[in-house]
């Protein structure tokens, strides 16, 4: 796609004024840039900046969406992009709440089938290739605002109207309560709130912790799993290696995680996905006569 | 359904400048790039650049850069380019297009659908 | 800037026939490719775009294939109303740019 896009755009997010604020949050600096008499002041952090073309990237995925998807074609994409940007724009980035994504999660709810939701942990590519492939499965990358936001980076500046495009807040070296952590727990918390039935995780296999506490799944969507609705949480480890044959629901990690999900009154599956290649392959096409087997 | 509806056909002459206009109708306007696309006798199509009304944000290509302004008016669904200096190897038919999204892991891919019916731009002397 | 060569420039066909219209990448684009038909004096439209996907209310008798660096447009049965001018378009990098043409005529 068009990542590597002209430095020539016309495209101005700075009409805001430019103050300095003596409040630090987290372990940001603040550095002068621009030159001049009068410096202009920057608040500097440890992760990335902002997507380069971020609001223009917000509103055609936004457009896209509503176009493929016609329950959602009453939605305004002008209103979704005032919304978005009105949830992080002129505040400072390690202050944003649930509360500022309010107005964004208004306009952007969607009914899902609450019983063909997809969770995933540190297995993202497979658990969307499996949906493109099942398509009356959900992971949250498949509704409109886990579609926005994926992979996508942004942040404001306190009291300016700017975009920052050199570096925003990194949940763990400066804050957690910034605009991109905030949303995605904001979303999450939602999107598991919702769910019913038999609820799917896919987790990887090839990872020290298959089951982290400290992963959106783990500190988010498990606690927020209605016991009153979600009959069952069945997880699918997937295998890394061609040749590992062992039985990856027996991992300390878990048992970890059937105990918290036992705890909440929801009864609690695993299966070993041995091949994921092949798996997507079956899923494709169930008639394959080698996919009577174990995968 | 989206129509685009351009403006007539000119004739300038050589160093003088030419405002297209293409109005929309039936869609959302303002949340959709309009582009630029001009076809010269016996050459290629040839993408200008576009407009995203929403923000009001223009992106030239390079060898354009400097003699193209696109504009929009949201109150009247109506975009336009303007094409400063003319000369004679300006002359081609000038098309407005909506741009489609397609797919593309991080920003969709750019088609045009629909075009205008384009504006043929006449520069002699 | 990413350069489309459009082959063969012309393409004699009757109707019935199959039609293969050939777009080349100067570099590989993936999947980031369109296909347009103009017939004279109209403006391009829309035939396939992301390198296989039929645009809304072509025939099926147009498809599309390739990535990378290759791709093809196939009419798989020519109509009257098919011989036209087409033209490819790549999506993958800026500035956006488009092929030669490749001009189906009537044998």
């Known amino acids: 796609g068009l990542n590597d896009i002209f430095e020539a755009q016309k495209i101005e997010w700075h009409e805001g004024s430019h103050h300095h604020h003596h409040h630090h949050h987290g372990s940001g600096s603040l550095v002068p840039r621009g030159s001049g008499s009068v410096p202009r002041w920057r608040q500097q952090w440890s992760g990335p900046g902002t997507t380069k073309r971020f609001p223009e990237t917000v509103l055609a995925r936004c457009v896209k969406y509503t176009e493929i998807h016609p329950e959602m074609r009453h939605v305004d994409c002008q209103s979704v992009w005032d919304a978005f940007k009105g949830a992080f724009i002129s505040k400072h980035p390690c202050n944003i709440t649930e509360e500022d994504y309010q107005p964004l999660m208004k306009l952007g709810t969607q009914t899902v089938p609450c019983n063909k939701i997809l969770l995933w942990s540190r297995i993202k590519d497979l658990a969307h290739q499996f949906t493109q492939v099942q398509r009356d499965m959900f992971t949250l990358e498949d509704t409109l605002l886990g579609y926005l936001a994926d992979d996508l980076t942004w942040c404001g500046e306190f009291n300016t109207s700017k975009i920052n495009y050199q570096s925003c807040p990194d949940w763990r070296k400066d804050c957690s309560n910034n605009p991109v952590s905030v949303f995605w727990k904001t979303v999450s918390r939602r999107f598991a709130e919702a769910a019913c039935d038999v609820v799917h995780v896919m987790l990887n296999g090839s990872r020290s912790k298959i089951f982290d506490k400290n992963s959106t799944f783990g500190s988010v969507e498990v606690h927020n799993l209605q016991p009153e609705k979600v009959q069952t949480l069945e997880a699918w480890v997937i295998h890394g290696g061609r040749e590992d044959s062992r039985d990856l629901c027996q991992d300390p990690t878990i048992k970890e995680l059937e105990s918290i999900i036992s705890k909440r009154n929801i009864q609690f599956s695993c299966k070993n996905i041995y091949r994921p290649d092949k798996f997507l392959q079956c899923v494709k096409n169930p008639e394959d006569s080698s996919c009577t087997s174990e995968i | 359904q989206v129509q685009l509806v351009q403006s007539g056909a000119e004739v300038k002459k050589p160093g003088s400048s030419v405002k297209v206009s293409c109005k929309a109708s039936?869609?959302?306007?303002?949340?959709?790039?309009i582009s630029w696309v001009r076809q010269a006798p016996g050459k290629r199509l040839e993408w200008m650049g576009w407009?995203?009304?929403?923000?009001?944000?223009?992106t030239y290509v390079q060898k354009f850069q400097g003699r193209v302004t696109i504009t929009a008016d949201e109150s009247t669904s109506t975009a336009y380019m303007e094409l400063s200096s003319l000369r004679s190897e300006d002359t081609a038919v000038y098309y407005c297009?909506?741009?489609?999204?397609?797919?593309?892991?991080?920003?969709?891919?750019?088609?045009?659908?629909?075009w205008g019916q384009g504006t043929l731009v006449t520069v002699s002397s | 800037e990413i350069v489309l060569t459009q082959s063969p420039a012309t393409l004699s066909a009757s109707p019935g026939e199959r039609a293969t219209l050939s777009c080349r990448a100067s570099?590989?684009?993936?999947?980031?490719l369109a296909w347009y038909q103009q017939k004279p004096g109209q403006a391009p439209r829309l035939l396939i775009q992301?390198?296989?996907t039929r645009a809304t209310g072509i025939p099926a008798r147009f498809s599309g294939s390739g990535s990378g660096t290759e791709f093809t447009l196939t009419i798989s049965s020519l109509q009257s109303e098919d011989f036209a001018v087409y033209y490819c378009?790549?999506?993958?990098?800026?500035?956006?740019?488009f092929g030669g043409g490749t001009k189906v005529d009537i044998k």
């Open positions: 297009a909506r741009v489609k999204y397609g797919s593309g892991s991080y920003y969709p891919n750019n088609w045009f659908d629909p």
């Open positions: 039936g869609g959302n306007f303002i949340s959709y790039s």
């Open positions: 407009i995203i009304p929403i923000f009001g944000t223009t």
């Open positions: 570099q590989s684009i993936s999947s980031n």
């Open positions: 992301d390198s296989s």
């Open positions: 378009q790549q999506s993958d990098n800026w500035p956006l740019t």
